[in-house]
């Protein structure tokens, strides 16, 4: 009976240093197999003693055509089990197998970590035929190895729908430590502890970490990767980096700046964009944020007037946009305006103060003692009033606006007249007879039109009626006077 010899496949431990059945090389490793005697390669790296049972999948060949003798089971010959080399070196390794000539169309494929290697790989298969068997040597070469070439490589051969698999060849590419996590720049609160993390990998392992703060080593002894540095607090900006060491050498991380959060710098360039009688639109350029986002800003407004009590009005606003409309101001007044902004640490100093003025306002009171009477001979209405007691902020009086509304039998018509500031009387032509005329007067400044006086009504009779009694607004009452004829 034919028995199948098998052995437990044990994974090779991945640690630096030569292993039984391993090749450590820092030069080009060319496991070349010249054709010397028949198909037997001359140079083989064998981790096993002679006569060691073969491993991997074995194909049990069928009986020969004559039916007289059995062929030995097919298996790949043992080769080097573990190749250790430095990054950027070249490596070549191979599988070999002797296949009886009765088998046709034998192909060998290379696999890495369970995936077939296809395409642009340097795989060469050479055949060395003999009388009864053909030696097949499949070579795989990698130029300038990288870490990504690390892994377990095997050969597979299909024969009669059977698959023969070689022992794995472990390729371990060693190099300088490679950072998988580096410290990050941060903005921190003064005298408050924070953490930085550094992680680097080989192979070779172990990777040891040294922390550097402002060019001074923080830890005198190496710490295993990954390492978390608890910085006990800073009073000023500092630069941190970490050094990763392994047997191949040293890699230094990027240096990161740790900033200390502070109050913001004051805003600059406070500008006036628009002024009205009661509002001023300002903008500003934010100062440096102190390594902490702005939360809000405060607009401070002081009236520049020797008679004012010097109190400051404060208007809070969001930090963005850098613009604010100050409202509820007095007309024709001078103000000093400053801006301050805050972050989580506190308020900035106030910006340089700027002067701004509101424009003239409209009058706030109506003309007084409005009287209206009919001058029938001239067919007009005489209107008289007293100049209102306007505040300085309303600006200079430029005139008056007279509104007269004529109402009769379902018809209503409003007319407006403008008169100069020196006048305190006006005459308007009668528009309609047998009608009511309602008169209101407002003072006008550059700032606008003030409130209209209370309406004064006068009845305009049909032709032939004579009455010179005036209608008037009492001063200062708010009755609705009507001339009763």
């Amino acid at each position: 009976a034919i028995t199948e010899a098998r052995e437990e496949a044990k994974p090779y431990p991945l640690f630096p240093g030569p292993l039984p059945g391993s090749l450590q090389t820092d030069h080009t490793s060319l496991l070349s197999l010249p054709h010397t005697s028949g198909y037997q390669p001359a140079l083989m790296f064998s981790p096993t003693q002679p006569g060691r049972p073969y491993t991997g999948n074995v194909a049990i060949p069928r009986v020969t055509s004559a039916g007289s003798k059995l062929l030995p089971p097919l298996a790949f010959k043992h080769t080097v089990g573990h190749i250790i080399l430095s990054e950027h070196k070249d490596v070549k390794f191979n599988c070999s197998i002797s296949v009886p000539n009765i088998y046709q169309d034998t192909t060998i494929s290379w696999w890495k970590d369970g995936k077939e290697l296809l395409g642009a790989h340097h795989a060469i298969t050479q055949f060395y035929p003999d009388d009864e068997v053909t030696a097949i040597i499949a070579s795989f070469s990698i130029t300038s190895v990288q870490r990504s070439d690390n892994g377990s490589y095997i050969c597979k051969m299909k024969i009669n729908n059977e698959e023969i698999v070689s022992d794995p060849i472990y390729i371990e590419v060693q190099g300088l430590p490679h950072f998988t996590k580096q410290p990050e720049s941060m903005n921190v609160t003064r005298n408050t502890a924070f953490n930085l993390t550094c992680q680097a990998v080989g192979p070779p392992e172990p990777v040891n970490i040294f922390w550097v703060q402002n060019s001074s080593r923080v830890n005198e002894q190496p710490e295993k990767s990954p390492s978390v540095l608890t910085v006990p607090g800073l009073t000023e900006m500092a630069v941190f980096s970490c050094e990763a060491h392994n047997d191949k050498g040293l890699t230094v991380s990027k240096g990161v700046q740790i900033n200390i959060k502070a109050i913001p710098s004051p805003p600059t360039e406070v500008s006036i964009h628009n002024s009205t009688a009661h509002s001023i639109l300002i903008s500003w350029v934010p100062g440096f944020d102190g390594y902490s986002p702005f939360r809000n800003c405060s607009v401070q407004v002081k009236e520049v007037d020797p008679l004012s009590n010097g109190s400051v009005m404060i208007f809070n606003t969001s930090a963005s946009p850098h613009m604010y409309q100050i409202k509820q101001l007095q007309a024709l007044a001078n103000y000093s305006i400053g801006v301050s902004c805050m972050n989580e640490i506190g308020w900035s100093a106030v910006s340089p103060w700027i002067l701004a003025s509101t424009t003239e306002g409209a009058p706030s009171v109506a003309p007084l003692n409005v009287t209206v009477f009919l001058n029938e001979s001239r067919d007009n209405v005489d209107i008289r009033w007293m100049k209102p007691l306007t505040k300085r902020q309303a600006g200079e009086l430029v005139g008056y606006r007279i509104s007269h509304v004529w109402q009769s039998a379902g018809i209503s018509k409003e007319l407006l007249e403008e008169v100069g500031q020196n006048n305190s009387r006006a005459q308007i032509s009668v528009q309609v007879h047998n009608a009511t005329c309602t008169v209101r007067i407002a003072a006008v400044t550059k700032g606008g039109v003030g409130p209209f006086s209370d309406p004064v009504k006068i009845f305009i009779p049909a032709h032939g009626w004579v009455d010179h009694a005036p209608s008037s607004t009492p001063a200062p009452g708010n009755a609705d006077p009507v001339l009763i004829i």
Epitope: Q213, N214, S216, V218, N219, E220, Q221, L229, P232, T235
Partner: antibody, heavy 118, light 106 residues
């Protein structure tokens, strides 16, 4: 708990040698350096240097080179300070300390008094 | 070598009083550690990295400072606080100690 236990007091003649031991317990010995600090009678603390317990490499402060040797036996978590050709001015209490990040000495031995007198 | 100068050399105070100890460095240092030593005893860690209390140290002790100027403050002296206090710098080798400040009972 972390402990550093030093060997007992020594009385030596000038020209002799002395070896002070410092046995560490309660932590992984090779993770922290061992520093040595001298305190002469009535004087302040003077840093002598330290030994890297991971590599065995010693670092000596100025004035402590030549006659002073730091060594280790990691198998028994012990650091040693050896002083040769002793002089009267070597009379002092010698402390071993555990060094951590930022050169902070967080644990101290109880001190070993070395008296050099003829 | 960074030289650390502690002042005053001696501070005479009564229990309950506030003690302010100064340590000046000849050039800027990253952190300052403080140790307390009583007669016949080994030094004991007090303040780590300028302002962090070592384990078991009461809150009446505090540390502050930056650059070349560092301070240890004891807000209200207790009888057990009368001792010698040393500062020690971290920045560059060698690791130097200050000359010490003795806090004695007035």
């Amino acid at each position: 708990q972390v402990q550093l236990v030093q060997s007992g007091s020594e009385l030596k003649k000038p020209g002799a040698s002395v070896k002070v031991s410092c046995k560490a317990s309660g932590y992984t010995f090779t993770n922290y350096g061992v520093h040595w600090v001298r305190q002469a009678p009535g004087q302040g603390l003077e840093w002598m240097g330290w030994i890297n317990t991971y590599t065995g490499e010693p670092t000596y402060a100025q004035g402590f080179t030549g006659r002073f040797v730091f060594s280790l036996d990691t198998s028994v978590s012990t650091a040693y300070l050896q002083i040769s050709s002793l002089k009267a001015e070597d009379t002092a209490v010698y402390y071993c300390t555990r060094g951590t990040r930022y050169a902070y000495m967080d644990y101290w031995g109880q001190g070993t008094l070395v008296t050099v007198s003829s | 070598e960074i030289v650390l100068t502690q002042s005053p050399a001696t501070l005479s105070l009564s229990p309950g009083e506030r003690a302010t100890l100064s340590c000046r460095a000849s050039s800027s240092v990253g952190y300052m550690h403080w140790y307390q030593q009583k007669p016949g005893q080994a030094p004991r860690p007090l303040i780590y990295a300028t302002s962090n209390l070592a384990s078991g140290i009461p809150a009446r002790f505090s540390g502050s400072g930056s650059g070349t100027s560092y301070t240890l403050t004891i807000s209200s002296l207790e009888p057990e606080d009368f001792a010698v206090y040393y500062c020690q710098q971290w920045s560059s080798n060698p690791r130097t100690f200050g000359g010490g400040t003795k806090v004695e009972i007035k």
